[in-house]
Amino acid sequence: IWELKKDVYVVELDWYPDAPGEMVVLTCDTPEEDGITWTLDQSSEVLGSGKTLTIQVKEFGDAGQYTCHKGGEVLSHSLLLLHKKEDGIWSTDILKDQKEPKNKTFLRCEAKNYSGRFTCWWLTTISTDLTFSVKSSRGSSDPQGVTCGAATLSAERVRGDNKEYEYSVECQEDSACPAAEESLPIEVMVDAVHKLKYENYTSSFFIRDIIKPDPPKNLQLKPLKNSRQVEVSWEYPDTWSTPHSYFSLTFCVQVQGKSKREKKDRVFTDKTSATVICRKNASISVRAQDRYYSSSWSEWASVPCS
Amino acid sequence: RNLPVATPDPGMFPCLHHSQNLLRAVSNMLQKARQTLEFYPCTSEEIDHEDITKDKTSTVEACLPLELTKNESCLNSRETSFITNGSCLASRKTSFMMALCLSSIYEDLKMYQVEFKTMNAKLLMDPKRQIFLDQNMLAVIDELMQALNFNSETVPQKSSLEEPDFYKTKIKLCILLHAFRIRAVTIDRVMSYLNAS
């Protein structure tokens, strides 16, 4: 058993039929010695008396808010949560496996630049009685500070009859140098509590590996005289690290017809302009990627050929 | 990335072309190592990230763009002494383009070159003959060092009398390649910045 926060404790249980469970001793936080009784949740049934209560925690019915009283007055509370371990593996019931980039990916993180700011998100089908707490650090043995905000519900999607909820959190490394070469990964730890179930999820990454630039901005077309060709120009996204001559991007320019089956013409360039042939009803899209370290491509920025 | 590559103008900052070749060569070598050593811990998640140049050179700090010198987090151990030598400097006189930066890059390359050559000698003794260092990568390191044109003492190649542990050598190769790729990225950024200055 360990303390998650004040008056909230996590009991780690091996979860299998007829498991013996864990013996837990609760102590009433009071100078009083006599006349103390214990109850669980809203029940008025007295579970025991005395300053300490010994319980055998085997299942969710044994978890909950234990309260010690004296003469009708509440003295203190202890909330017991369960962390299930099945076949040696901690349960992951609360979050959905996003299966990208690999199986057992519960947390996904992205950074728009090298500033040390990043966003992580996760999915769940659970809509109520759910809380998240996020902590992060650079390295684990001698951790350096990363500050994370509160997790918020960022999207709701309908999947068949069920809804899926996306939560996200923004974190910022306390003293980040955009040019630094990372040798210790960022660790992100999410505590999830659904009713009386506790689970924790972790992700470890280098900022350089989760870079995904914003799409190029100010995408414009300039027709070339007496030609079907156009000059496409764009700019670096505002959120990208500066100076751009040091944090350079490379670009992919694509001409895509109306039909998805039509052949796509693609050009790769390090410049912020390109000359392409604009077909009728086609659209021109440009996306960006770090020129020197191949992490993710940005989403496409698009303009119609017409 | 297998993308069309533009050839730089001959008048361009002399080291840019070499640094681009270096990054391409080390990336290809790392990819080859990951594939060949698929049953070894050779991915970024599996290896320990060691920097053989740590406390010996200060490339990131010495080559910091001017715009980032205002960022206190980038100034932990910034060197401020300059040496003026090296053909890559050409005639440009920007305070950023300090010879210290280029000499630091040169020292990095020299250290990695020695490590890779020592390692290759061991890998050539492996009866499995599973992996060797790409000669092109070693050649590209050499070319960039020549373009940097710094004179420094030659570091003797390490020779070891004991029987090599090939498993450990291959793990070390992965660690070295990952670290060298990260340094090659920094070198490429620096050369691009110098070229634009």
Partner: antibody
Framework: QSVEESGGRLVTPGTPLTLTCAVS????????MIWVRQAPGEGLEWIGI?????NTYYASWVKGRFTISKTSTTVDLKMISPTTEDTATYFC??????????????WGPGTLVTVSS | FELTQTPSSVEAAVEGTVTIKCQAS??????LSWYQQKPGQPPKLLIY???KLAPGVPSRFSGSGSGTQFTLTIGDLECADAATYYC???????????FGGGTEVVVV
């Protein structure tokens, strides 16, 4: 502590109807409230809940046919455009107070809604 | 999400025992309650958290199970136990909520 439904009557299809659940002996700011219905001779079917903070959650089949709202002492169920399939006894119940998704330990007697032309 | 109750109807003698099963289509931990409903009356809570007896409910009623399999057992049957019994999952309103189809208990 009690709840009581009212407003059930005979209506023609398509005529909006609002059922009201009046509570006494407790505050709605501490409990989830649920609306459940039971067609003649059928089982219990949950329609939707309103949490202590006023958030509403509906069964997937509802699809905009009902809306739940509350005041300080009442919880309303609005039937937007009733059909004959909505003929049932409508129950309002109070949660235990432990959770939003809760079990229900205080039930009203129910109010009968008949939708017929 | 579905809660399947079996059997839909059961007949038992006074002082006998009845067992009703409730199966969830996914794990709902122990977030299951049982209700008793008599004709013309609202449901009455018997059991919550799968096995905890609601105040004032005789100990002849007991609940067990967790995950996806749950059981309500009524021992020492009385005529007054003739009613329809429903299980209810309250795991989450989106990911596991609702009532079972009901089990009619006839006491002979």
């Amino acid at each position: 502590q009690s709840v009581e439904e009212s407003g059930g009557r005979l209506v023609t299809p398509g005529t909006p109807l609002t059922l009201t659940c009046a509570v006494s002996g407790f505050s709605l700011s501490g409990y989830t409230m649920i609306w459940v219905r039971q067609a003649p001779g059928e089982g219990l079917e949950w329609i939707g809940i309103i949490s202590s903070s006023g958030n509403t959650y509906y069964a997937s089949w509802v699809k905009g046919r009902f809306t739940i709202s509350k005041t300080s002492t009442t919880v309303d169920l609005k039937m937007i455009s009733p059909t004959t399939e909505d003929t049932a006894t409508y129950f309002c119940a109070r949660g235990s107070g432990a959770y939003i998704s809760d079990y229900f330990n205080v039930w009203g007697p129910g109010t009968l809604v008949t939708v017929s032309s | 999400f579905e809660l399947t109750q079996t059997p839909s109807s059961v007949e038992a003698a006074v002082e006998g025992t009845v067992t009703i099963k409730c199966q969830a289509s996914q794990s709902i931990d122990s977030w299951l309650s049982w209700y008793q409903q008599k004709p013309g009356q609202p449901p009455k809570l018997l059991i919550y958290s799968a096995s905890k007896l609601a105040p004032g409910v005789p100990s002849r009623f007991s609940g067990s199970g967790s995950g996806t399999q749950f059981t309500l057992t009524i021992g020492d049957l009385e005529c007054a136990d003739a009613a329809t019994y429903y299980c209810q999952s309250y795991y989450d309103v989106n990911a596991g909520y609702g009532f079972g189809g009901g089990t009619e208990v006839v006491v002979v």
